[in-house]
Interface confidence: medium
């Protein structure tokens, strides 16, 4: 008898090369094989559970950056007046959550912020829990 | 044929709002659906393997905090004279281990330390390994 | 009917007690039960996917240390002029990758660097993806 295979784990890596003041970071998923999707510049959460979250990037100017998942809830990450980020976190997310950036720059500039090595990774840690597809 | 489902992953999120000097932090599990259990203010390990461990909190006064898993072994985390913690680690734990806090304050105060956003998450990384239920 | 079991997750913990200037760190796997293998002082990657990577150690002298996975690609970790490391990261690795150290010391010494608590852990986060055994 063939041993059971794992169904694919919900995970995604998105890249971002620019962010906009009072808006967010423009995210793109370089792979078509991701098991999670990007919609309206947000990562859509279909499965309840803990997620491992990795966030990296070097910014062209100082900014404050937050990563949100639900209106009215505190951010997953919040960094004030930084020019780079290299953080890992764990958070409980649920169906209907959407993971998205908010960015504020401290110059009066209208320009978008350029990002080197901008990468956000989400990996579901509780396969077997509730998912809505 | 229905594809095989994942059995639930061993994981738990506990919260703590206060810690006691020369003792530990009082942990509670807000969810009844956790796959791991709290007993005698410790998280009980039933499954061998690597665990992803996330520890967060803001303390009302400076303290030294350690997170232990086995008598006679070094701590999983050890923080000296801090007022906050936001750490992630990976450790190998095994059946019969118990994860618990030890706290020391540096004031002569007898009072409890209040904790804002106190959270400890453990997520098993090796399903398929040995478990004793 | 017996519920399906998880096949073992690809993971390994290697230890290193010394590193060599302009070379790497001598890694050994203390357990025979690891699901990943060490070959020519490198950890062999058989399965595509995200990996959780934990790197720890205290060094006997200041060094610059990088952890590589593929020729011509940037490092997984790069630390300049440090005497210790305690880092966690997430990276996408693929079949044929090999994870190995590169070390440079800043003394003129030819002697090995001694390492206390030197530990590198890799844990595959995408079971169900492609593996070549």
């Amino acid at each position: 008898q063939v041993p059971p295979q794992y169904p694919p784990i919900q995970s995604i890596r998105v890249q971002f090369t620019r962010c906009e003041n009072e808006k967010g970071c423009i995210i793109t998923s370089p792979s078509k094989d991701e098991t999670m999707k990007v919609q309206d510049n947000s990562i859509i959460i279909n499965c309840d559970g803990f997620y491992l979250i990795s966030l990296k990037g070097y910014f062209s100017e100082e900014l404050s950056l937050s990563l949100y998942y639900r209106k009215g809830r505190g951010p997953l990450f919040s960094l004030s007046k930084v020019t780079s980020v290299d953080s890992i976190g764990v958070a409980y997310l649920a169906f209907k959550d959407k993971v998205y950036f908010n960015v504020t720059t401290h110059s009066t500039s209208y320009k978008d912020i350029q990002v080197n090595g901008g990468e956000l990774i989400l990996i579901h840690q509780n396969p077997g829990g509730f998912c809505a597809y | 044929q229905v594809p095989p489902q994942y059995p639930p992953i061993q994981s738990i999120r506990v919260q703590f709002t206060r810690c006691e000097n020369e003792k530990g932090c009082i942990i509670t599990s807000p969810s009844k659906d956790e796959t791991m259990k709290v007993q005698d203010n410790s998280i009980i390990i039933n499954c061998d393997g690597f665990y992803l461990i996330s520890l967060k909190g803001y303390f009302s006064e400076e303290l030294s905090l350690s997170l232990y898993y086995r008598k006679g072994r070094g701590p999983l985390f050890s923080l000296s004279k801090v007022t906050s913690v936001d750490s992630i680690g990976v450790a190998y734990l095994a059946f019969k281990d118990k994860v618990y806090f030890n706290v020391t304050t540096h004031s002569t105060s007898y009072k409890d330390i209040q904790v804002n956003g106190g959270e400890l998450i453990l997520i098993h990384q090796n399903p398929g390994g040995f478990c004793a239920y | 009917q017996v519920p399906p079991q998880y096949p073992p997750i690809q993971s390994i913990r290697v230890q290193f007690t010394r590193c060599e200037n302009e070379k790497g760190c001598i890694i050994t796997s203390p357990s025979k039960d690891e699901t990943m293998k060490v070959q020519d002082n490198s950890i062999i990657i058989n399965c595509d996917g995200f990996y959780l990577i934990s790197l720890k150690g205290y060094f006997s002298e200041e060094l610059s240390l990088s952890l590589y996975y593929r020729k011509g690609r940037g490092p997984l970790f790069s630390l300049s002029k440090v005497t210790s490391v305690d880092s966690i990261g997430v990276a996408y690795l693929a079949f044929k990758d090999k994870v190995y150290f590169n070390v440079t010391t800043h003394s003129t010494s030819y002697k090995d660097i001694q390492v206390n608590g030197g530990e590198l852990i890799l844990i595959h986060q995408n079971p169900g993806g492609f593996c070549a055994y």
Partner: antibody, heavy 115, light 112 residues
């Protein structure tokens, strides 16, 4: 293919007003900041004004502050430059450019301020 | 404001010959983490400007590999390895590290 088409340039008397428009196509307009750059006769290039993708943040060169207003309508893929209290020294070709690093330019529209 | 100074202001080159334009910034264009915001533009006679090079040395799509950018800190160079008749025009450098974006005064390239 990215295209930027400016319009609205004209001959106007000092103290007069003009509204320049730039219609964009070939890219997701609402995701990018936009700029206006001018070139006086036989002169170099000067950034005049810029606006972020949401329209919530703007930049003006000192010489036009309080007189010019940059705005955008993302539904119409259009960026505007409202120019009031025009002076002779505002005479130039006005170019619309994509982003603050000007990776694409329009063909320009000529503004002449003269009595 | 950062001042960008180009040299020479004009040059005349025969087809097939190399050409080089220098651009000097009044302060370093290097950001703390390594990006340098130096750009090159070309304006052909009667046309709008076109960006050729971004971040010192990266060619924009469609720009021939005859064009190359180099430099660091405050000193930068645009090189054309083999000039062609179509390369005639005014070349501008520009910096984007600090508001406002400022351009050099331009270098007029004439083909003999």
């Amino acid at each position: 293919e990215v295209q930027l088409v400016e319009s609205g340039g004209d001959l106007v008397k000092p103290g007069g007003s003009l509204r320049l428009s730039c219609v964009a196509s070939g890219f997701i307009f609402s995701s990018y900041s936009m700029s206006w750059v001018r070139q006086a006769p036989e002169k170099g290039l000067q950034l005049v004004a810029g606006i972020n993708s949401a329209g919530s943040s703007t930049y003006y060169t000192d010489a036009v502050k309080g007189r010019f207003t940059i705005s955008r309508d993302n539904a119409k893929n259009t960026v505007y430059l409202q120019m009031n209290s025009l002076r002779a020294e505002d005479t130039a070709i006005y170019y619309c450019a994509k982003r603050w690093v000007f990776d694409f330019w329009g063909q320009g529209t000529l503004v002449t301020v003269s009595s | 404001h950062i001042v960008m100074t180009q040299t020479p202001l004009s040059l005349s080159v025969s087809p097939g010959e190399p050409a080089s334009i220098s651009c000097k910034a009044s302060q370093s264009l290097l950001l703390s983490y390594g990006n340098t915001y130096l750009y090159w533009f070309r304006q052909k006679p009667g046309q709008s400007p076109q960006r050729l090079i971004y971040k010192v040395s990266n060619r924009d799509p469609g720009v021939p590999d005859r064009f190359s950018g180099s430099g660091s800190g405050t000193d930068f160079t645009l090189r054309i390895s083999r000039v062609e008749a179509d390369d005639a025009g005014v070349y501008y450098c520009g910096q984007g590290i600090q508001d406002p974006f400022t351009f050099g005064q331009g270098t007029k390239l004439e083909i003999k």
